[in-house]
Interface confidence: low
């Protein structure tokens, strides 16, 4: 397994609708045709997988139907969007990139993006 550099923003603030987007960029040492991107969440020293997608270079990034993530790829950049976030989901979101094919296998893990989620204030009931 060979190491690879992955860059991602340090901080992102989720929108009032609970949507956070960030770019994950990797320094590809070779001409990979198959790439796997995994988003990990680290909170209270526990790491959990948020979502993952495998894609062929030049094709769209397809997450599973049950995933809260969507994304697009452009060259060595992956634009990730995480939806449905609430305040309790605030944490460090780490981008992990694997160059699956052809060999050799490369693995890169970013330093993480701290996503802050603030639950919107409830709107007062309206008479009209």
């Amino acid at each position: 397994c060979k190491a690879m550099h992955v860059a991602q923003p340090a901080v992102v603030l989720a929108s009032s609708r609970g949507i956070a987007s960030f770019v994950c960029e990797y320094a590809s040492p070779g001409k990979a045709t198959e790439v796997r991107v995994t988003v990990l969440r680290q909170a209270d020293s526990q790491v959990t997988e948020v979502c993952a997608a495998t894609y062929m270079m030049g094709n769209e990034l397809t997450f599973l139907d049950d995933s809260i993530c969507t994304g697009t790829s452009s060259g060595n950049q992956v634009n990730l969007t995480i939806q449905g976030l609430r305040a309790m989901d605030t944490g460090l979101y780490i981008c992990k990139v694997e160059l699956m094919y052809p060999p050799p296998y490369y693995l890169g893990i970013g330093n993480g993006t701290q996503i802050y989620v603030i639950d919107p204030e409830p709107c007062p009931d309206s008479d009209f």
């Epitope: 997988e49 769209e60 995933s67």
Partner: antibody, heavy 120, light 106 residues
């Protein structure tokens, strides 16, 4: 109505390859992923991998990595699953099954299955 | 890989009785999907997204659960319900199925 029709049973020797076809009809072929699942005799279900017929991007179960290739022929709305370096424990019924999307049911449609027997 | 463990492996009941089977995931999943399979036949989608009945599935079937623990319930068994039931997760690759619960006539 949606139909997935698979190719017939195959008898193969260890080390050989098999290519199973799955012809789809009754829907727009490129709108849904096609998955492949297998079931060894008396055993449970095991996911092999899938393909997006539009982009032809694939995802495979790492267990089969390097031995399996899933392809499509968009002109005939047919998906193919090729498994190489066959072993006796690859003896199973192989199913193609149509994926869904966020607003649809997943794996609601299945082919009739193709029995692949690996024996010397 | 998310491992799904179904229990019990075999459930022996009589028609008219209530059947409850479980599916436990090794890590949290978003939804659970359930399939019914009869000998020599392809699996049939029963419930998707934890609790949504697939087209044509009778209302005696229901699904529930969240996180790592999910349940399939058949409120009143009919003779045609005796089959093997599989749970499946689509939260992360590889997609995985449980080993199955065989529902047999007592």
């Amino acid at each position: 109505q949606v139909q997935l029709v698979q190719s017939g049973a195959e008898l193969k020797k260890p080390g050989a390859s098999v290519k199973v076809s799955c012809k789809a009809s009754g829907y727009t072929f490129t709108d849904y992923n096609m998955d492949w699942v297998r079931q060894a005799p008396g055993q449970g279900l095991e996911w092999i991998g899938n393909i997006n017929p539009n982009s032809e991007s694939t995802s495979y179960n790492q267990k089969f990595k390097g031995r399996v290739t899933i392809t499509v022929d968009k002109s005939t709305s047919t998906a193919y699953m090729e498994l190489r370096s066959l072993r006796s424990d690859d003896t199973a019924v192989y199913y193609c099954t149509r994926d869904g999307n966020r607003y649809d049911a997943w794996f609601a449609y299945w082919g009739q299955g193709t029995l692949v027997t690996v024996s010397s | 890989e998310i491992v799904l463990t179904q229990s019990p492996a075999t459930l022996s009941l009589s028609p008219g009785e209530r059947a409850t089977m479980s599916c436990s995931a090794s890590s949290s999943v978003t939804y659970m999907h359930w399939f019914q399979q009869k000998p020599g036949k392809a699996p049939k989608l029963l419930i998707y997204s934890t609790s949504i009945l697939a087209s044509g599935v009778p209302a005696r079937f229901s699904g529930s659960g969240s996180g790592t623990d999910y349940t399939l319930t058949i409120s009143r068994l009919e003779p045609e319900d005796f089959a093997t039931y599989y749970c499946q997760q689509r939260t992360s690759y590889p997609l995985t199925f449980g080993q199955g619960t065989k529902l047999e006539i007592k």
